[in-house]
Each structure stands twice: as structure tokens, then as C-alpha cells.
Amino acid sequence: SRLRQEDFPPRIVEHPSDLIVSKGEPATLNCKAEGRPTPTIEWYKGGERVETDKDDPRSHRMLLPSGSLFFLRIVHGRRSKPDEGVYVCVARNYLGEAVSHNASLEVAILRDDFRQNPSDVMVAVGEPAVMECQPPRGHPEPTISWKKDGSPLDDKDERITIRGGKLMITYTRKSDAGKYVCVGTNMVGERESEVAELTVLER
């Protein structure tokens, strides 16, 4: 076809951004391009073209009219992780093509099983007490907090330090006795460890 004066090659006017999304949730990688004639948009992940509903109506990925890639739900298994990776959108017309910036799609996970559950501790009044837990594997890395007898632990108490998976009470009081649970939290949700009992004995 003859080159028309008003025609121009594609340019990306909205680039996709990095995403962290929970498994099973919907997500959108945005892409918008200008050009005349209107460019076609394709998506690539790790150099391979991404199949969408345009290729297979049963696909969980949809190419929106805007050019954005919409995931009905993020699919992510123990082994197969088809949605995770680095994406680019490519806009094409007969005058050329434009490639977006890279956008990484990471899947947030939080496993069920604590790598280390806290153990029961018995101390005398005034002695230090330490409980330790390792939360389930997760991405983003889960933050750790503690509950005592079902309520969040008051970490404003200067005797109490939470560092990594360690709960340290510098000198114990009788009132510190109770049932403690380690809580691992990220954007997926929270997981609670098994209960550990702190027993504080009178001297």
C-alpha cells in the first residue's frame, strides 16, 4: 500500500508497570500506543509471544481493546508459573514497531507451613525469655508479629523486642505468662503458628 502523508509509525504512550499480585487475583498490565494506521498490539514474556483470548477463547489472559493485557486470575502453581515473568508490549503497523519498557509480574505467595514453630518456655520471674519462629516461605517476605492469648502483643513495652523471628522479653513478669502465637503476614494474608506456652515461675 502507498505511504500516506498523515501515516506515522507506532509509539508507546503508556508503558506497563511492575506488578506484584496474589495468586488467583485479576491483574492488568497496561499498554497504550499511538500510530496511523492504528497499531496492532502483541505481548511477549521472556521473548515468547503471550497467548491471549484472541488465540484461544478459553485463555485466562485477555487482550483489551486499549492494548492492555488483562489476567482474569493469576495462575501460579507449585511448579508451573505461567504468568510470572518479564513482559513487553509491541505495537506494530506497516511503518514499523515500538517496544515498551520491561514490566515484571511477580506472584505474591504465602505458604501454609511454618518452617519453625515456637516452643514452650519456662522461666523464673525476672529472667529473660526468648521464643523463636520461622514463618512460612512467602513473597514478599512475610513480616512477623506475635499474639499473646489471642491479642496482638504490645511491642511498645520496652522489655519486649521483636527481631527477625525472635521474641525477646528482657525480664519477665508473672503477667507475661500465657499462650503465644507467631504471625506471618504479607499481602496474601496471614498465617498463625502453633501455640507456645510461656510459664513464669515465682522465685
Epitope: 514474556k45 509471544r49 497467548e51 495462575v75 507449585r78 511448579r79 508451573s80 505461567p82 515473568g85 501454609d112
Partner: antibody
Framework: EVQLVQSGAEVKKPGASVKVSCKAS????????MHWVRQAPGQGLEWMGW????????EFPQKFQGRVTMTRDTSITTAYMELSRLRSDDTAVYYC???????????WGQGTMVTVSS | DIQMTQSPSSLSASVGDRVTITCRAS??????LNWYQQKPGKAPKLLIY???SLQSGVPSRFSGSGSGTDFTLTISSLQPEDFATYYC???????FGGGTKVEIK
């Protein structure tokens, strides 16, 4: 259409090797693990191992370690399973199967009959 | 390895019957269990994944339940096309149960 197409039937002598191919189409080949499952005549399904097409990593149950090799060619979106030192009890239909992101084998090849006979 | 024990190994039933097949894992596998249907000369077909999720395109008369070590596949009203062999599979170590053949009574 998402599909797996396997190579044709093979007849082999005991002690020989067989290499079965599995051509994937309609999906991103490197996004899904590929497994091999076999079924002896009149018997149940037996998992033989997996390959991660993204990096070529493999894992096999102890029964097949040292005798099975799984490879892939990403340029032609094809996975291969080679079984060596064949015995008559290796006579079976061999399937490739894609593992979905839901941890299940959602797409299967049509199967390849391998007969081991002297 | 986690072993999967399926029962019964075979059963006879009539069209319209409610059919239940059980699968037991030798240790807890949470909800990592799948069910497949296989007809003679054909590749297996995924019915249920993650213990209770129905695979797209599978009739709603099929359902799965259970978690931990004990799982069930139920066909609420057996149809002529349901006569086949059914396999459970745990997706932690990927091994299959021995299969249950559903035959016409």
C-alpha cells in the same frame, strides 16, 4: 488450540533405547512443566518425571533414575523422553502431559505405544 | 514417597446411580489432589483439581471433596458416557492411585 502431539509407535529390542517426542503448540512452552506418564497394557498410570522447559531442570522418581533422560528444544517447542536399557516390562503407552498452574495435568498428548520384544 | 490408595478397584453401577470413589494418601497432602477419567485407548482427562475444583468443561455431576489424607470423587447421577476408569493423583509427589473401573451393572 492448546495441544500436545507425540511421535509415532516404536518397536524396540531389549537393551535398546527409545526416544519419544512431544510437540507443544498454542501456549507459552516455557511457562509450564512437562511430565511423562506411562501405562502398561491393562495397568494403571505411572508418573515418570518432569522437565522444566524454561531451564531444562528435571526430576524423576527413584525407579527411573539413571535410565530416563528428559530434554527439550525451546526453538521448536518440543519435549523429549528417552528411556534406555529397555526391558519387556517397559512395553507401555507413553504420554506427555502439561502441568497447569493449578498443579494438575490439564493437557495430554495422544500417547505413544512402545513395544519391547525380542 | 506418598502412596495413594484408591478404593474400590472396580464397581458395577447403573445409569442414574450415585457413585462414590475414595482415595487415601499415606500422609497429609492438604488439598493437593486431582481426579482423572480415562476411557479405553484414550489419554486421561482432568476432572477435578485441588481436591474440589471442577475443571472447565467438565459436567457438574462430578464433584470432589476432602483434604489431608482422605478424598472422595462423587458422580451424582451416572450417565452412559461415565463408564470409564478413574484415577486420583497427588500433586505434591505426583504419584497416581491404582484406579477404579466403573462398569455397567
Amino acid at each position: 488450540e492448546v495441544q500436545l502431539v507425540q511421535s509415532g509407535a516404536e518397536v524396540k529390542k531389549p537393551g535398546a533405547s527409545v526416544k519419544v517426542s512431544c510437540k507443544a503448540s498454542g501456549y507459552t512452552f516455557t511457562g509450564y512443566y512437562m511430565h511423562w506418564v506411562r501405562q502398561a497394557p491393562g495397568q494403571g498410570l505411572e508418573w515418570m518425571g518432569w522437565i522444566n522447559p524454561k531451564n531444562g531442570d528435571t526430576e524423576f522418581p527413584q525407579k527411573f533414575q539413571g535410565r530416563v533422560t528428559m530434554t527439550r528444544d525451546t526453538s521448536i517447542t518440543t519435549a523429549y523422553m528417552e528411556l534406555s536399557r529397555l526391558r519387556s516390562d517397559d512395553t507401555a503407552v507413553y504420554y506427555c502431559a502439561r502441568e497447569s498452574g493449578d498443579d494438575a495435568f490439564d493437557i495430554w498428548g495422544q500417547g505413544t505405544m512402545v513395544t519391547v520384544s525380542s | 514417597d506418598i502412596q495413594m490408595t484408591q478404593s474400590p478397584s472396580s464397581l458395577s453401577a447403573s445409569v442414574g446411580d450415585r457413585v462414590t470413589i475414595t482415595c487415601r494418601a499415606s500422609q497429609s497432602i492438604s488439598s493437593y489432589l486431582n481426579w482423572y477419567q480415562q476411557k479405553p485407548g484414550k489419554a486421561p482427562k482432568l476432572l477435578i483439581y485441588a481436591a474440589s475444583s471442577l475443571q472447565s468443561g467438565v459436567p457438574s455431576r462430578f464433584s470432589g471433596s476432602g483434604s489431608g489424607t482422605d478424598f472422595t470423587l462423587t458422580i451424582s447421577s451416572l450417565q452412559p458416557e461415565d463408564f470409564a476408569t478413574y484415577y486420583c493423583q497427588q500433586s505434591v509427589g505426583l504419584f497416581f492411585g491404582g484406579g477404579t473401573k466403573v462398569e455397567i451393572k
